[in-house]
Interface confidence: low
């Protein structure tokens, strides 16, 4: 019977750590000579197994090749690693009397794809916080996967984003691969509760993609709106001033009251009000004894947020000497509001 070496599977896929069988059958045992398994072709091919009875870690013959009529030269590779990926050839040699064995026929080859899971995606963002309307880049990285085909998607609050660039390295064949993707996000003031998600889908993940998450709260700064107002007097001798810092993030806030430019009170906020969008509000009350002030006084509320330059709002209250009518109070509609003591 004419010799034919058959490798029925063009390819097999195996998860890292599992076993795989590479099948090889012959139609004839003649001419006499060994069968060997190689990975790769050409001068640099690697001898994997030769059925010569020697111990090869992780590789066993499937059938008993010592039997005279055995024509099954399949092998089992156990505990497969990404380094085992490649094309395996079952090769028949003719035994030489004095010269080396001569290769007479090879099977068509079986490609082993080692399925290695990608690492959990890591999403990194800018080192410094951005502000609303600023465009910031996020990068997602995952490594160690095989085969090379992989899908990476970006989402912001459930909406898919289009990446600036996605690259899978190396570009040639390799035992495992890495993916890196960059997306650009336009921050807005409602993003404190938002998340940017990098989702990686791969054949090894059984329809359960891996996700890397970046909470935009770690990458955004929303500066407060600061307003100073005067409440209606509670008695003849006192004025209530209120400084309100609204919709800021993160929490880090320092508030100082100044009287004619001199520090009057340091206010370290403790009980912040949290808004539904994740930002905070803070209200500072400043009770001023009017009997101590006959001249105009400029009160300043100075707010320092997250190590940023201070935001100041002035509020002028007219001295007692200006007031002809004990019940009067003038208001000037701007940030430097002016009121009578009363």
């Amino acid at each position: 019977k004419e010799l034919k070496v058959t490798q029925p599977e063009k390819s097999v896929s195996v998860a890292a750590g599992d076993s795989t069988v590479l099948n090889c059958t012959l139609t004839s045992l003649l001419p006499v000579g060994p069968i060997r398994w190689y990975r790769g072709v050409g001068p640099s091919r690697l001898l994997i197994y030769s059925f010569a009875g020697e111990y090869v870690p992780r590789i066993r013959n499937v059938s008993d090749t010592t039997k005279r009529n055995n024509m099954d030269f399949s092998i089992r590779i156990s505990n497969v690693t990404p380094a085992d990926a490649g094309i395996y050839y079952c090769v028949k040699f003719q035994k030489g009397s004095s010269e080396p064995d001569t290769e007479i026929q090879s099977g068509g080859g079986t490609e082993v794809y080692v399925l290695a899971k990608p690492s959990p995606p890591e999403v990194s963002g800018p080192a410094d916080r951005g502000i609303p309307d600023q465009k910031v880049n996020f990068t997602c990285k995952s490594h160690g996967f095989s085969p090379r085909n992989i899908t990476l998607k970006w989402f912001k609050d459930g909406q898919e984003l289009h990446p600036l660039e996605t690259t899978v390295n190396p570009s040639g064949k390799n035992v495992s691969y890495n993916i890196s993707s960059t997306v650009r996000v336009v921050l807005n003031s409602m993003d404190v509760n938002s998340k940017v998600i990098c989702e990686v889908a791969h054949i090894t993940l059984d329809r359960s993609p891996l996700r890397g998450i970046a909470n935009l709260s770690n990458f955004i700064r929303v500066s407060p709106t600061v307003k100073v107002t005067q409440q209606s007097p509670t008695s003849m001798n006192q004025v209530n001033l209120t400084c309100r810092a609204e919709r800021f993030y993160p929490e880090d806030l320092q508030l100082i009251w100044l009287e004619n430019g001199n520090v009057s009170r340091n206010d370290t906020p403790k009980n912040l009000t949290k808004n539904t969008d994740g930002t905070y509000n803070y209200t500072s009350l400043f009770l001023v004894n009017s009997s101590a002030h006959r001249e105009d006084v400029v009160f300043t509320c100075q707010v320092k947020h997250d190590q940023q330059p201070a935001i100041t709002r002035n509020h002028t209250v007219l001295g007692f000497a200006h007031s002809s009518d004990q019940g009067s109070m003038q208001t000037f509609p701007d940030n430097n509001a002016t009121h009578n003591w009363n």
């Epitope: 465009k135 090379r148 085909n149 992989i150 899908t151 990476l152 998607k153 909406q159 898919e160 984003l161 289009h162 990446p163 600036l164 660039e165 996605t166 690259t167 899978v168 390295n169 570009s171 993916i179 993707s181 336009v186 807005n188």
Partner: antibody
Framework: QVQLQESGPGLVKPSQTLSLTCTVS??????????WSWIRQHPGKGLEWIGA???????YYNPSLKSRVTISVDTSKNQFSLKLSSVTAADTAVYYC???????????WGQGTTVTVSS | DIQMTQSPSSLSASVGDRVTITCQAS??????LNWYQQKPGKAPKLLIY???NLATGVPSRFSGSGSGTDFTFTISSLQPEDIATYYC?????????FGGGTKVEIK
Amino acid sequence: QVQLQESGPGLVKPSQTLSLTCTVSGGSISSGGYYWSWIRQHPGKGLEWIGAIYYSGPIYYNPSLKSRVTISVDTSKNQFSLKLSSVTAADTAVYYCSKEGYHSGMDVWGQGTTVTVSS
Amino acid sequence: DIQMTQSPSSLSASVGDRVTITCQASQDISNYLNWYQQKPGKAPKLLIYDASNLATGVPSRFSGSGSGTDFTFTISSLQPEDIATYYCQQFAYLPWTFGGGTKVEIK
């Protein structure tokens, strides 16, 4: 100057798979920085984006077609291809391939190839 | 998906007229918008990218503006060769979507 040329059968029977190839000339598909897209246009209608591939592997599909579409790239032949399975008469359209830079738009298009789905 | 609403769907203008086409996105897409021209039987041609940048070799009578959800495409002085259908396209969110098109004719 990059040029694109679509090729493939102009007539496909219902339930079969539509296969088109876009050949890139005047530049390398694997030079990076570009997406290679497929777009179609039903007779007398607007444009519909089918999907895009980046030379190094990542592929993006229109969800409305995702279950039937496969886009692949063959860097050795400087080609990318589209396969659309289980076609019906509703897939009759002019199919275009295009090159797109993220911040330079779809600046190169093939001339388009008409595919009719009919028995 | 992001919906791109283009208006008008068709218009007729005289040579030399100023022609304006608007495109509205169903949500904020920043400036991630392109404009294309398509003549009968031909492939689309890129005119404007990133909302306002003129593509290479495109005459300066074409311009684009806008950001967020509202965008405008203008032909400052209509020429006979400008008879075509014009499309906007967003690329902020997948899947990329096109407007329904505006057919421009000469009176």
